[in-house]
Interface confidence: low
């Protein structure tokens, strides 16, 4: 692994893909989507120290600024780098449809 | 505004871009950058409140996440959704040369 | 190569209004701020304004009559209301870099405009 | 706004003679200024960038210094393609101040 993968904080802690195991109603969806009725939400969590999976020149400056002033500026923080796909079965006036959703589902993280 | 560009919480305490002056020193590039010496790097701060600025179905999803399962999931948070563009004039063997970096100063914001 | 040709100056009655171009080639205009500069005959540079990535600055005695614009590839000056004394050498002027400081480093040649009845 | 001064308005050298001309800012502008050479009929063409740094292609005998309120730009050793009008430009627009240019300083052959 590159050295912005290895997590200083120990194992797990910082930025990484988690699933959440979610219903429809959890996300609020019961009202227009049938299906599927439960959901593997992937979801970007954990910390992000310094170097650890900087997305950009933008996370390196923010990094450095928030070291300099941690009340004005927040540390950069753990968000989708992209996106899987998913289907949802969605209830219309006159049935169903299949609607994709481009961004919906984290596929892997980065810090922002 | 859109109903999104409504801060709850108070004027200017939501996700929106900021302005911060900062030396190359404070941004640890002394270095390797000549010039310029001092940047107003513009980023992404604030809270991000239901339904504001939401970039995506994701972040509507993690938002919803977090209020049920808030020591788990976090809220989303504020992050650029486009960049400007910025040279610098950096330091090589041989003398200066100018680099632009497409994602340094952040554009506009939105919550992830 | 990089290039800024300005076009569009001439002659013009006093009262009247006048668009410039400066086209810009070999980089793309939105990548960088731009500057109008004029030099009346004999006289020293003259600084009007500047387009950025989020609008427009002026000189202070610039602001009113003198508006800059870009599309995707011209950077325009109009100018309302000339008066005799906006006679001069009008330049666009590319900005080396942005964010704090904003010096001009390369330039077109320039387009005559005057103003006279 | 910002003022500009620059100082002499005119000089005459020699060859090989080592040349100074500053230019004062009318309020505290850090080291954001640039140097600027211009010759008969032809556009500024930039010589210094922040107050000290070279631009690029532009030869060491031109060199620039200051911060705040005074600076200087000076030719080490004049030859004579530096015979033309410098001016200084202030590029400090955080504030909205605009980027006013001093009135020049004509270098002419004694």
């Known amino acids: 692994a590159r050295n912005g993968d290895r997590c200083p904080l120990g194992p797990g802690r910082c930025c990484r893909l988690h699933t959440v195991h979610a219903s429809l109603e959890d996300l609020g969806w019961a009202d227009w989507v049938l299906s599927p009725r439960e959901v593997q939400v992937t979801m970007c969590i954990g910390a992000c120290p310094s170097q650890f999976r900087e997305a950009n020149m933008h996370a390196q400056i923010k990094m450095n600024l928030h070291r300099l002033k941690p009340d004005t500026v927040p540390a950069p923080c753990c968000v989708p780098a992209s996106y899987n796909p998913m289907v949802l079965i969605q209830k219309t006036d006159t049935g169903v449809s299949l609607q994709t959703y481009d961004d919906l589902l984290a596929k892997d993280c980065h810090c922002v | 505004a859109r109903n999104g560009d409504r801060c709850p919480l108070g004027p200017g305490r939501c996700c929106r871009l900021h302005t911060v002056h900062a030396s190359l020193e404070d941004l640890g590039w002394a270095d390797w950058v000549l010039s310029p010496r001092e940047v107003q790097v513009t980023m992404c701060i604030g809270a991000c409140p239901s339904q504001f600025r939401e970039a995506n179905m994701h972040a509507q999803i993690k938002m919803n996440l977090h209020r049920l399962k808030p020591d788990t999931v976090p809220a989303p948070c504020c992050v650029p959704a486009s960049y400007n563009p910025m040279v610098l004039i950096q330091k090589t063997d041989t003398g200066v040369s100018l680099q632009t970096y497409d994602d340094l100063l952040a554009k506009d914001c939105h919550c992830v | 190569e990089v290039q800024l040709v300005e076009s569009g100056g001439g002659l013009v009655k006093p009262g009247g209004s006048l668009r410039l171009s400066c086209a810009a080639s070999g980089f793309s205009l939105s990548n960088y701020y731009m500057s109008w500069v004029r030099q009346a005959p004999g006289k020293g540079l003259e600084w009007i304004g500047m387009?950025?990535?989020?609008g427009t600055t002026y000189a202070t005695w610039a602001k009113g009559r003198f508006t800059i614009s870009k599309d995707s590839s011209t950077v325009y000056l109009q100018i309302n209301s000339l008066k005799t004394e906006d006679t001069a050498v009008y330049f666009c002027?590319?900005?080396?870099?942005?964010?704090?400081?904003?010096?001009?480093?390369?330039w077109g040649q320039g387009t005559l405009v005057t103003v006279s009845s | 706004d910002i003022q500009m001064t620059q100082s002499p308005s005119s000089l005459s050298a020699s060859v090989g003679d080592r040349v100074t001309i500053t230019c004062q800012a009318s309020q505290s502008i850090s080291s954001v200024l640039s140097w600027y050479q211009q010759k008969p009929g032809k556009p500024p063409k930039a010589l210094i960038y922040e107050a000290s740094i070279l631009a690029s292609g532009v030869p060491s005998r031109f060199s620039g210094s200051g911060s705040g309120t005074d600076f200087t730009l000076t030719i080490s050793s004049l030859q004579p393609e530096d015979f033309a009008t410098y001016y200084c430009?202030?590029?400090?627009?955080?504030?909205?101040?605009?980027?006013?240019f001093g009135g020049g300083t004509k270098v002419e052959i004694k």
């Open positions: 002027a590319r900005v080396v870099y942005a964010g704090w400081t904003y010096p001009l480093g390369i």
């Open positions: 387009i950025s990535f989020s």
């Open positions: 430009q202030a590029n400090y627009d955080v504030y909205n101040y605009g980027n006013p």
